[in-house]
């Protein structure tokens, strides 16, 4: 005998199917049989294979019961069913969207619902006629009323909404309906009056007005100087480019999608032409200086400063600073000089009236008291006065009074005020002339004479011997001059050229060690003897290592 | 326009955690609906779960329940996802998006890149 | 969950071709249905939505239609834009719901 097919369940309810889920029967089967009722009490019969041990019967009807039975056959032979009775799930009722007007630009929505565990509600408010204006309101699913402001006036819109209730979507319900009308604007004022601007406020209620028409008049010629619209969000605008000290009438209308409003109207004058005041002269150089100057902070083009000597009115230079500015530096003026200075600002195409002051320039920076001390053989010391803070450098030429040797010239920091000259020839007269260098100035040249001590005749080495020559060292061996010296200066060369090498040992030596040479190449050697500033003439010889 | 931007690329090992953030612009971000999706390389998208920022309550799909948890941050228009006990089948591309009132997901972020490996 | 079936898993077609995509639902969903696009290293691109509502922007020759547990994307004339990969989602679940395995649209 067939044994019933095990523990047939229902794992699944939905509002239109149910999962069934059971165990094979022991006895072998060729196939299952499932019946289940419909509401109507017709019995509807699907044969499954006998591997199947689940089953989704679908197309159901929302909140009704269904008894399903369950049979294993082989051949003409049924099991027992196996029985289950289970229903699918309501569908949540979500009815009776109503929507009216909750003022010219909101709407108020009212439904109706089960009491069941709704979670949400989504409703969506969108323009009949433009889809891309969708809004979207998620609300809790204890509402059954809802408030949506900020709409457009007089506009049709599409509300729709659906609820939310175990995890899933319930169908969705819409309405048409639009907003009311226009209330009217409020009252309109003016703020912050300039001499060339004025800020307009008005009231009006939110969301009211698509835009907002403002036409500037100007009242003694009648004239429109200014038509604007603005955005309906707004309750303030700037206008600027009035002109000075005159009067305008300025109406207002809010303008919706289909119709504007009475006009609103306000008087207003305007302020006088501002002007400049303040003008100061700081910083004054003797090649410039810095022009500083008050004003109201309003919006000046830009400035024209003119500068020109007292004594030479030909002699005027112009220039136009930007509006943001109210100092300026001058520079490249004469040293010494007496100038006038005038400047007057320009405003929406207006010259506001000239201010002028006097100003004298500082004396030329100076350089002076340029002096020789220290005198040797071969140097001397300079030093001079100068203009603190003023030089850049001062340029030291030097001439041999026989101008037989090459000037040399020396460009020395401007913070310096002493030099010292090396390298010259003893028992030689020199002229040294210096001057300052400045950003815009050479100051004119000052000078001096100098004359090298003479140098004191001083006996040279004699007979140069090496001796213990290596690959790369020898000794180099000398007899000193009769007279006592402080010390001897080896310098030694590769014949073909490079680096000179030097060692200086005591007066008392008479012989060194040269180390480090090159293997194979001739070395040329000299050998000066040394005291104090003054040196002999040289001695030389040659070795090959 | 909403614009979605989302976390940097993260690399984690087998049984760690990772946490995906993803910060909204434009639009009023706690009224709608910030869903996860992910898709593994080569393979198909995957609905993971998502939230209602302004009740802050999320549903998750069955696969996932358990192991993942949806937040969102109103005062910084931000949603995060975090997914628990790694395991390299989840490497993957997570992807957040915004619904539109039909659920259809209309606007998409940029794609984070999660790679588990020991 | 609703488990979501697409047909076919790959199709193949030619510039100009009308191309139809199926999508069933394991139950009655009505009409929570989106389509997507999506395109290799791109986020998916939102198509349709409540199975038959073009989302802005998208060109008319995608349409959708169907209800219940049957749905169709139709591209009435297929472009060279238009070879990418295609999943449709049910939206019955909130805030959403499961995807299809996808449809891959390639050249013939």
């Known amino acids: 005998e067939l044994d019933t097919p095990k523990d047939l369940q229902v794992s699944e309810t939905a509002e239109t199917s149910l999962t069934l889920l059971w165990k094979t029967p022991l006895a072998k089967f060729d196939r299952y049989r499932l019946n289940y009722s419909l509401p109507t009490g017709q019995w509807v019969g699907v044969q499954l294979p006998r591997n199947t041990t689940s089953y989704v019967l679908r197309g159901l009807e929302p909140g009704q019961e269904y008894n399903v039975l369950l049979t294993a056959e082989k051949g003409r032979h049924k099991s027992k069913p196996a029985r289950v009775k289970a229903s699918t799930e309501e569908v949540p009722s979500l009815e009776n969207l109503t929507v009216t007007e909750a003022g010219w630009d909101g709407l108020r929505l009212n439904w109706t619902a089960d009491d069941l565990a709704y979670e949400y509600f989504v409703i969506q408010v969108q323009e009949a006629n433009n889809v891309e204006t969708a809004h979207n309101f998620t609300v809790p699913g204890n509402l059954r009323a809802a408030d949506i402001p900020g709409l457009k006036v007089a506009t049709s819109y599409r509300v729709s909404i659906y609820g939310v209730a175990r995890g899933y979507r319930t169908p969705v319900l819409s309405a048409e309906t639009s907003t009311g009308t226009t209330p009217n604007l409020g009252e309109v004022t003016v703020a912050e009056v300039g001499w060339d601007a004025l800020t307009l406020n008005w009231t009006a209620p939110e969301g009211a007005y698509k835009n907002f028409f403002i036409q500037v008049l100007e009242a003694d010629t009648t004239q429109t100087v200014q038509n604007l619209t603005v955005p309906g969000g707004l309750r303030s605008v700037d206008l600027p480019g009035l002109k000075a000290a005159t009067r305008y009438y300025i109406t207002l209308r809010g303008v919706t999608q289909d119709f504007g409003t009475a006009p609103l109207s306000v008087e207003v004058l305007t302020e006088d032409l501002p002007q400049l005041g303040g003008l100061s002269v700081t910083e004054v150089s003797w090649d410039g200086l810095t022009l500083n100057w008050t004003t109201d902070d309003l919006a000046y083009k830009h400035f024209v400063v003119q500068v020109q000597e007292a004594n030479n009115v030909e002699a005027a230079q112009n220039l136009t600073v930007p509006g943001s500015l109210r100092a300026v530096d001058i520079p490249g003026l004469k040293a010494d000089t007496p100038y006038r200075v005038s400047i007057y600002g320009v405003i929406q195409g207006y010259r506001t009236p000239m201010l002028s002051t006097d100003v004298s320039t500082a004396r030329e920076p100076e350089i002076g008291n340029l002096n020789v001390s220290d005198v040797t053989p071969k140097s001397f010391n300079l030093s001079w006065t100068a203009t603190d803070g003023i030089f850049d450098m001062f340029t030291i030429e030097i001439i041999d009074s026989n101008r037989l040797l090459q000037t040399a010239e020396h460009n020395i920091s401007g913070a310096e005020r002493t030099a010292h000259i090396s390298g010259l020839p003893p028992s030689t007269d020199f002229i040294v002339y210096l001057s300052g260098i400045a950003p815009s100035i050479r100051t004119k040249t000052i000078s001096t004479t100098a004359t090298t001590e003479a140098l004191t005749a001083m006996g040279s080495p004699k007979e140069v011997i090496f001796s213990d020559i290596t690959e790369n060292s020898a000794t180099v061996s000398w007899r000193a001059p009769t007279a006592q010296v402080e010390s001897f200066r080896i310098t030694y060369v590769p014949i073909t050229g490079g680096t000179p090498s030097m060692v200086t040992v005591d007066g008392t030596k008479t012989q060194t060690r040269l180390v480090k040479l090159i293997p194979g190449v001739e070395y040329l050697v000299s050998i000066i003897a040394m005291k104090g500033f003054e040196e002999s003439e040289p001695v030389s010889g040659s070795f090959t290592t | 326009q909403v614009q979605l931007v989302q976390s940097g690329a993260e690399v984690k090992k087998p049984g760690s955690s990772v946490k995906v953030s993803c910060k909204a612009s434009g639009g009023t971000f706690s009224s709608y609906a910030i869903s996860w999706v992910r898709q593994a390389p080569g393979q198909g998208l995957e609905w993971m779960g998502g939230i209602i920022p302004i009740f802050g309550t999320a549903n998750y799909a069955q696969k996932f329940q358990g192991r993942v948890t949806i937040t969102a941050d109103k005062s910084t228009s931000t949603a995060y996802m975090e997914l628990s006990s790694l395991r390299s089948e989840d490497t993957a591309v997570y992807y957040c998006?915004?619904?539109?009132?039909?659920?259809?997901?209309?606007?998409w972020g940029q794609g984070t890149t999660v790679t588990v490996s020991s | 969950d609703i488990q979501m079936t697409q047909s076919p898993s790959t199709l193949s077609a030619s510039v100009g071709d009308r191309v139809t995509i199926t999508c069933r639902a394991s139950q009655s969903i009505s009409s929570w249905l989106a389509w997507y696009q999506q395109k290799p290293g791109k986020a998916p691109k939102l198509l349709i939505y409540?199975?038959?509502s073009l989302e802005s922007g998208v060109p008319s020759r995608f349409s959708g239609s169907g209800s219940g547990t049957e749905f169709t994307l139709t591209i009435s004339s297929l472009q060279p834009d238009d070879f990418a990969t295609y999943y449709c989602?049910?939206?019955?679940?909130?805030?959403?719901?499961?995807f299809g395995q996808g449809t891959k649209v390639e050249i013939k």
């Open positions: 998006a915004k619904g539109n009132f039909y659920g259809g997901l209309d606007y």
């Open positions: 409540d199975a038959s």
């Open positions: 989602q049910q939206n019955k679940k909130f805030p959403s719901g499961t």
